[in-house]
């Protein structure tokens, strides 16, 4: 687990379910019980016991990660799907997004790659074997986020309420912000964009920027290089 | 077609308690977000609580003029929200209303409320 | 907490004439593209029912009459042509951050 880890309100990702005790402190505009507490605005806050964060696809976990069952490598299989650990070099593999960055799916193992732009949710071709047991649906998460009475025919536009980023329109994302995820726009050249130095850090975010647009990467401004590691900027830029 | 139902209001003591329910049905209960809004007589809307669903954890949300005295909760067997309301003061006198996120990040559909009066 | 502003109190008007409500916010409500700007009427003894989200884009339902402008702090709502059942009391509401406000309404009254 992580301990303390710092969050930027203004950063992004998701925030993971916590457990355990309620928050809360003298002053704070509200209150994200259990364990969390926010202001808003650029202040910063402590959260402890990261826990796993449920996620509907890659996208939605740090760069370090992949979405999954916990029982199972595949993502896309009925039951709870979390963000996982990256497989390193020669670790066996589905699809590109389990490999850790620099490293890509290549008949079911991950191996070292120049180019790190390969989709991330790209099937890797030629794989027979379950990389782990089946996992049984029927654990609350769902599958799809429709209402019972209605039938979408249209992709969601920025502020619409998503589950996945394939329920939103082109050029957005599923992104969190706060208690709801909404459809957000991708990010283009030049924009902030959050780099998960940290290992599991990006569930502790609970305003999430969409990733990079095509042909960009999210790498730290040039500019910026002299300044301390913890206030380091980065922005989306051609690869 | 989406309908929530609030009861459980009424009136209560200052330092009293209540716990108010919101009956949900027409869509997918537990994957989303819900909250509770109330309004004074006479005034304007104020945030209570919520609490968001299944993909973010069912996290619980509140304002600190309600934090420690009020706690929002939800039984997705049941396609209910609750909350219970402890210490209640003359200034929680209110219609509170339960609100949820279907397709909009806003509150786009709401219940037709419950009155809670707190009084001596 | 991000305080709205809304202008005027009360707003007289026929029907058919148009209705310009405005929500000044005492900071930025726009991030990530969004302005978090919602706009909902409410009518007497009812709950209210949102026209507009994300500062502009019209709420399922919501006839074409009412649109939503502006960004960063200052919204408006129109009505382009007020209808009988057009006359309530309007209010809008942030939800850029936590906790999330509304503004003190505009009530519409028919002159």
């Known amino acids: 687990t992580l301990n303390s880890v710092l969050i930027n309100s203004n950063a992004i990702k998701n925030l993971p379910p916590p457990l355990g005790g309620a928050g809360g402190q003298p002053g704070s505009a509200v209150s994200v019980a259990p364990g969390v507490l926010y202001e808003g605005g650029n202040k910063y806050q402590t959260l402890d016991n990261y826990q796993p964060y449920p996620c509907a696809e890659d996208e939605e976990c740090g760069t370090d990660e992949y979405c999954s069952s916990p029982s199972r490598g595949a993502a896309g299989v009925g039951g709870v799907q979390i963000c996982l650990a990256c497989r390193k070099r020669r670790k066996r593999c589905m699809r590109h997004a389990m490999c850790c960055p620099g490293n890509y799916c290549k008949n079911g193992i991950c191996m070292p790659s120049d180019h790190s732009h390969l989709p991330r949710g790209e099937i890797e071709e030629g794989i027979i074997e379950n990389l782990g047991n089946d996992h049984g649906a029927g654990d609350g998460y769902p599958r799809r986020t429709t209402l019972t009475s209605k039938i979408y025919h249209t992709k969601g536009q920025e502020g619409s309420v998503c589950l996945r980023s394939s329920d939103c329109a082109t050029g957005l994302c599923c992104a969190r912000h706060f208690w709801s995820k909404i459809c957000k726009p991708v990010l283009k050249e030049g924009q902030v964009c959050t780099k998960h130095r940290r290992k599991g850090s990006h569930g502790l975010e609970i305003f999430q920027r969409c990733y990079c647009g095509e042909g960009l990467a999210c790498r730290i401004q040039k500019d910026h290089h002299q300044t301390s590691n913890s206030s380091r900027l980065h922005t989306c830029q051609r690869h | 077609e989406v309908q929530l139902v609030e009861s459980g209001g009424g009136l209560v003591q200052p330092g009293g308690s209540l716990r108010l329910s919101c009956a949900a049905s027409?869509?997918?209960?537990?994957?989303?977000?819900i909250s509770w809004v109330r309004q004074a007589p006479g005034k304007g809307l104020e945030w209570v609580a919520s609490?968001?669903?299944?993909?973010?954890?069912?996290?619980?949300y509140y304002p600190d003029s309600v934090k420690g005295r009020f706690t929002i909760s939800r039984d997705n067997a049941k396609n209910s929200l609750y909350l219970q309301m402890n210490s209640l003061r003359a200034e929680d006198t209110a219609v509170y209303y339960c609100?949820?996120?279907?397709?909009?990040?806003?509150?786009?559909?709401w219940g037709q409320g419950t009155t809670v009066t707190v009084s001596s | 907490e991000i305080v709205l502003t809304q202008s005027p109190a009360t707003l007289s008007l026929s029907p058919g004439e148009r209705a310009t409500l405005s929500c000044r916010a005492s900071?930025?409500?726009?991030?990530?593209?969004?302005?978090?700007i919602n706009w909902y009427q409410q009518k007497p003894g009812q709950a209210p029912r949102l026209l507009i989200y994300a500062g502009s884009k019209q709420g399922s339902g919501i006839p074409a009459r009412f649109s939503g402008s502006g960004s960063g702090t200052d919204f408006t709502l129109t009505i382009s042509s007020l209808e009988p059942e057009d006359f309530a009391v309007y209010y809008c509401?942030?939800?850029?951050?936590?906790?999330?406000?509304f503004g003190g309404g505009t009530k519409v009254e028919i002159k």
């Open positions: 900071e930025s409500v726009d991030d990530f593209g969004i302005s978090f």
């Open positions: 609100a949820t996120s279907l397709e909009n990040y806003a509150f786009d559909y």
């Open positions: 509401q942030q939800l850029k951050e936590v906790p999330p406000t």
């Open positions: 027409g869509f997918t209960f537990s994957s989303y977000a």
């Open positions: 609490v968001s669903g299944t993909g973010l954890g069912f996290q619980t």
